[in-house]
């Protein structure tokens, strides 16, 4: 079952997700998507990192932590009730079926 996180309408929501890079800056690609983690990738991607940097995001979605040290926790700015639901954080570890998948439930009140 998903871990549940709460936020109030108009506030920022925080969805934690972490991994341990082999070395700072030696990054593993990560994607965040709205909806439960599918078999591969993320559905409805809102933010993505690659081996170098944050390379895709949409308005309101950003990383507040030190992502180059593995803190890829997602901040969603100024949330509304429509932001409620399941979010997927996927650590895309190289190799077959090595990904770490985390489903996080966001409840807005």
């Amino acid at each position: 079952s998903e871990v549940e996180y709460r936020a109030e309408v108009g506030q920022n929501a925080y969805l934690p997700c972490f991994y341990t890079p082999a070395a700072p800056g030696n990054l593993v690609p990560v994607c965040w998507g709205k909806g439960a983690c599918p078999v591969f990738e993320c559905g409805n991607v809102v933010l993505r990192t690659d081996e170098r940097d944050v390379n895709y995001w949409t308005s309101r979605y950003w990383l507040n932590g030190d992502f180059r040290k593995g803190d890829v926790s997602l901040t969603i700015e100024n949330v509304t009730l429509a932001d409620s639901g399941i979010y997927c954080c996927r650590i895309q570890i190289p190799g077959i079926m090595n990904d770490e998948k985390f489903n996080l439930k966001l409840v807005i009140k």
Epitope: W57, T58, W62, L63, N64, E77
Partner: antibody, heavy 121, light 107 residues
Framework: QIQLVQSGPELKKPGETVKISCKAS????????MSWVKQAPGKGLKLMGW????????TYADDFKGRFAFSLETSASAAYLQINNLKNEDTATYFC??????????????WGQGTTLTVSS | DIVMTQSPATLSVTPGDRVSLSCRAS??????LHWYQQKSHESPRLLIK???QSISGIPSRFSGSGSGSDFTLSINSVEPEDVGVYYC?????????FGGGTKLEIK
């Protein structure tokens, strides 16, 4: 292509107010913050702070708290720097520069052409 | 605030030379160090990010290295158009301070 176009040179007297604009094009304005950088004549670069273009929340460096204000006109994809009660030491070129919103992503990949402000009585 | 110190202040080189510009941070900033080039009467231009990552559109003769508090920008075969001032920037801690710059001149 991505462009940041700033307003033209300004000549002001001490005590007056100036408002410099920076109009963005070629990308979604609210997905990047906008930073402001001061360069005094013959000197180096000094970050004044930045503004979150989605929420409008500004962050000011200590030396630029008080007389300085960042603002937005999101519908026009424009950011503004206002300096009140101008002093001679405000004479400088002011640059806007695009910054990703992520806390640890602080390189500036696109810059405006600069606005030269001269404050003289 | 983190203080960024660049050396030398001025560097006079011959086209074709390999040059190294130094930048030192007053405390460790990991690899959160960015390099910019500013030509006369122009805006700064991002050259290198995260100490060593290349930027699209920047000539391959520019490279960066270092981590912690000591960093180097190298130009492996200087060309006349490389004249200008080179700034390093702390990208780790607000207010993301810049170094004082190194002015590159051609003999």
């Amino acid at each position: 292509q991505i462009q940041l176009v700033q307003s033209g040179p300004e000549l002001k007297k001490p005590g007056e107010t100036v408002k410099i604009s920076c109009k963005a094009s070629g990308y979604t304005f609210t997905t990047y913050g906008m930073s402001w950088v001061k360069q005094a004549p013959g000197k180096g670069l000094k970050l004044m702070g930045w503004i979150n273009t989605y929420s409008g929340a500004p962050t000011y460096a200590d030396d630029f708290k008080g007389r300085f204000a960042f603002s937005l006109e999101t519908s026009a994809s424009a950011a503004y720097l206002q300096i009140n009660n101008l002093k001679n030491e405000d004479t400088a070129t002011y640059f806007c520069a695009r910054k990703p919103p992520h806390y640890y992503v602080n390189s500036f990949d696109y810059w405006g052409q600069g606005t030269t402000l001269t404050v003289s009585s | 605030d983190i203080v960024m110190t660049q050396s030398p202040a001025t560097l006079s080189v011959t086209p074709g030379d390999r040059v190294s510009l130094s930048c030192r941070a007053s405390q460790s900033i990991s690899d959160y160090l960015h390099w910019y080039q500013q030509k006369s009467h122009e805006s700064p231009r991002l050259l290198i990010k995260y100490a060593s990552q290349s930027i699209s559109g920047i000539p391959s003769r520019f490279s960066g290295s270092g981590s912690g508090s000591d960093f180097t920008l190298s130009i492996n075969s200087v060309e006349p158009e490389d004249v200008g001032v080179y700034y390093c920037q702390n990208g780790h801690s607000f207010p993301y301070t810049f170094g004082g710059g190194t002015k590159l001149e051609i003999k």
